[in-house]
Interface confidence: low
């Protein structure tokens, strides 16, 4: 008769490597005397015999999955026992492995120049996939502006035009490699002007033609303005090569003027537009021009960037040492006094603060400031800072400020031109337009100074709705 | 006196970093926008980048753009440059320079005298 | 990506009269780009001689002045001085975006 025998584990068990849907098998031999009972776990939880996804067979010595799964990763141990000594038990991995899945692929993608885009590659598989991508028919080479990111993704900085093209995300692992679709990059690029016109001083009854190049995608279209509004005679002759448009305007020129050439394409919902402007002057009328007391140019401060209109020119005072930074720095002054005041407020006394230190600006012969409309600066004055206006000049009276109401660099509303007299002669606040069709109602306020020398100011209490004074249409 | 003096220059190999330090005296550091302009050998100035007194905003060649980054901290009156991921055509003598006023690009009115910056294997 | 030219060298006489121009490679330089001029002599740092087109740096003489002519930023040199004899470099200021602010290759004036 044979001698009881604990278990000994003959063939301890292995790392197996299984493809998902493909059968995986652990063997526990076992040596012992009686028969072991052999049981299975996995990530020490039982197996269930009746677990249709297993077959245990040669008495428990054979476990087979039958068809692998992602979840299905773990250690798995057999344990043997028979009563004699202990039980024992050996355990190995299974490790599912997968060929690489693009789970979610990039997608055609429209987008500005200088922006940031982003192509999603989101990859399974096991090994974990290494994703690269595909621009055209070369392979995409990652430089300050290109990386793929650890999820797979594209990420484009400060998009090019150049980036533009087919792109397609390849995931590869050991096991084999995964494609995406081709998808589509397209770059817009802002309207850009490559050639101004250039500004002429020429005899009466001459003919000039002025010329205005510009970039863009989509291709922008051009207009013409003169001294602010459409140009009325003159023929206008335009080719397009290469996403460049170019726009030669004829003249016969009688009188002296401003011209703006706008260019402008459309970037989904919203347009951008670049302009540029040429003077065209008559050689005898300029000889009688006074000297200039500053100069039109692009604001590039940043206190105001977000104010003023993108482009737009702006005036510069030569009286100022260094007209540019003293308009910034008595601007940046302005800015911290007007931290204290309502949300109601602060944007209106932004916009008219930046529009009245940095006025439009009309290059002409002479380059001319073009000063706030006084119905904006009675609004932002009487309904949207009223409070405020009033407190500070309260203690403007009562000798708090030194200089009243010069610590702010503010207008003074009753000295300005009224638009209704002129509308080309003075500057819209656009926020107050916009501000207007959103507000249904306001406060009382009353007026902090006598109106009779103001045309169409309203009486002393007033409601937005119904002021003339304020129609901003 | 008006001084600006730079430091942090040096031999890196290609793919490392170096931090370079610009500190100001003589005038209100936090009144100007401050600019990097770097000069490779034998060759033209190149604007690298700007910022303006308040730090609000930052500027860059497009050749350095992701790779360096211009900070400032007034109350030390200090100008820094972070350069990342260098090549070996970054090597230049990098001058600290003052701008004529607050924003970011005035003229350039000050110049320091320059650190050489290495980039090789 | 616009180029910002410039003679490579250039010669005048001392007492003559110089001028050096800086222009794009596409386009017209116009006071919105405000030219401001340089000059760096061998193993100095570079000096502001004018900015934004005609403003002269304090200290810097008379005889150097600036200007917007045609479609060009121009730097004069009247009366030139042996010590005038550098590197001279414009720079341009080209708006918002990448390369905001772009140097000329320089040209060499040499004073005979």
């Known amino acids: 008769e044979k001698l009881p025998k604990a278990p000994v584990i003959t063939t301890p068990l292995e790392t197996v490597d299984a493809l998902v849907e493909e059968v995986a098998t652990f063997m526990c031999a076992v040596e012992s005397y009686p028969q072991p009972e052999i049981s299975w776990t996995r990530n020490k939880i039982l197996i269930k015999l009746f677990d249709t996804r297993y077959s245990i067979r040669e008495n428990g010595q054979l476990l087979t999955i039958l068809s692998v799964e992602d979840s299905d990763d773990g250690i798995y141990c057999c344990i043997a026992n028979n009563g004699v000594g202990g039980a024992v038990e050996s355990c190995g991995a299974l490790q599912v492995k997968m060929k690489p899945k693009i789970t979610r692929p990039p997608i055609n993608v429209k987008i500005i120049e200088g922006l940031k885009a982003v192509l999603p590659c989101t990859t399974m598989g096991n090994p974990k996939p290494s994703v690269s991508w595909i621009k055209g028919d070369n392979a995409l080479r990652e430089n300050s502006r290109i990386a793929v990111l650890e999820s797979g993704s594209l990420r484009i900085h400060n998009v090019q035009k150049e980036d533009a093209g087919q792109y397609r995300c390849v995931a590869k692992n050991s096991l084999g490699t995964a494609y995406s679709k081709l998808v589509k990059l397209e770059v817009e690029v802002f309207a850009r002007i490559l050639r101004a016109p250039e500004s002429h001083n020429v005899t009466f009854g001459s003919f000039v033609t002025l010329r205005c190049t510009a970039i863009g995608i989509p291709v922008p279209t051009i207009s013409w303005i003169e001294n602010g509004n459409a140009v009325s005679s003159g023929s206008i002759q335009e080719s397009v090569k290469d996403r460049v448009i170019d726009s030669r305007l004829q003249l016969f020129i009688t009188k002296p003027g401003l011209y703006t050439c706008i260019a402008t394409n459309k970037h989904g919902e919203k347009f951008s537009t670049a302009k540029a402007a040429a003077t065209v002057s008559i050689a005898e009328w300029s000889k009688s021009q006074k000297d200039s007391q500053g100069y039109c140019a692009q604001y590039r401060g940043e206190v105001c960037d977000a104010v003023l209109a993108k482009d737009a020119l702006v005036f510069f005072n030569t009286s100022y040492r260094d007209p540019e930074d003293a308009q910034e720095l008595l601007i940046h002054t302005a800015w911290n006094e007007l931290k204290a005041v309502s949300p109601l407020c602060r944007p209106a006394a932004e916009a008219l603060l930046c529009n009245h230190l940095f006025q439009e600006c009309s290059p002409g012969v002479v380059p001319t400031p073009m000063p706030i409309c006084r119905e904006y600066c009675l609004a932002v004055k009487e309904l949207f800072c009223a409070k405020e206006w009033q407190a500070m000049e309260g203690k403007a009276h009562r000798g708090l400020y030194r200089s009243g109401m010069h610590l702010l660099p503010v207008p003074e509303c009753s000295k300005l031109p009224s638009m209704h007299r002129d509308p080309t002669a003075c500057t819209r606040l656009p926020y107050l337009d916009y501000k207007k069709e959103n507000i249904t109602t306001f406060p009382s306020i009353t007026s902090s100074r006598p109106s009779a020398d103001i045309p169409n100011l309203p009486a002393s209490t007033s409601s937005f709705a119904v002021s003339p004074a304020y129609s901003m249409t | 006196e008006l001084q600006l003096v730079e430091s942090g220059g040096g031999l890196v190999q290609p793919g490392g970093s170096l931090r370079l330090s610009c500190a100001a005296s003589?005038?209100?550091?936090?009144?100007?926008?401050m600019s990097w302009v770097r000069q490779a050998p034998g060759k033209g100035l190149e604007w690298v980048s700007a910022i303006p007194w308040n730090g609000g905003s930052t500027y860059y060649k497009e050749s350095v753009k992701g790779r360096f980054t211009i900070s400032r901290d007034n109350a030390k009156k200090t100008l820094y440059l972070q350069m990342n991921s260098l090549k070996s055509e970054d090597t230049a003598v990098y001058y600290c320079?003052?701008?004529?006023?607050?924003?970011?690009?005035?003229?350039?009115?000050?110049w320091g005298q320059g650190t050489l910056v290495t980039v090789s294997s | 990506q616009a180029v910002v030219t410039q003679e490579p060298s250039l010669s005048v006489s001392p007492g003559g009269t110089v001028t050096l121009t800086c222009g794009l490679s596409?386009?017209?330089?116009?006071?919105?780009?405000?030219p401001d001029w340089y000059q760096q002599t061998p193993g100095q740092a570079p000096r502001t001689l004018i900015y934004?087109?005609?403003s002269r740096h304090s200290g810097v003489p008379s005889r150097f002045s600036g200007s917007i002519s045609g479609n060009k930023a121009a730097l004069t040199i009247t009366g030139a001085q042996p010590e005038d004899e550098a590197d001279y470099y414009c720079a341009l200021y080209m708006g918002g975006g990448s390369n905001v602010y772009v140097f000329g290759g320089g040209t060499k004036l040499t004073v005979l």
């Open positions: 003589g005038f209100t550091f936090d009144d100007y926008g």
């Open positions: 596409s386009g017209s330089v116009t006071s919105s780009n405000y």
């Open positions: 934004t087109t005609n």
């Open positions: 320079a003052k701008r004529s006023g607050r924003i970011a690009f005035g003229a350039l009115d000050a």
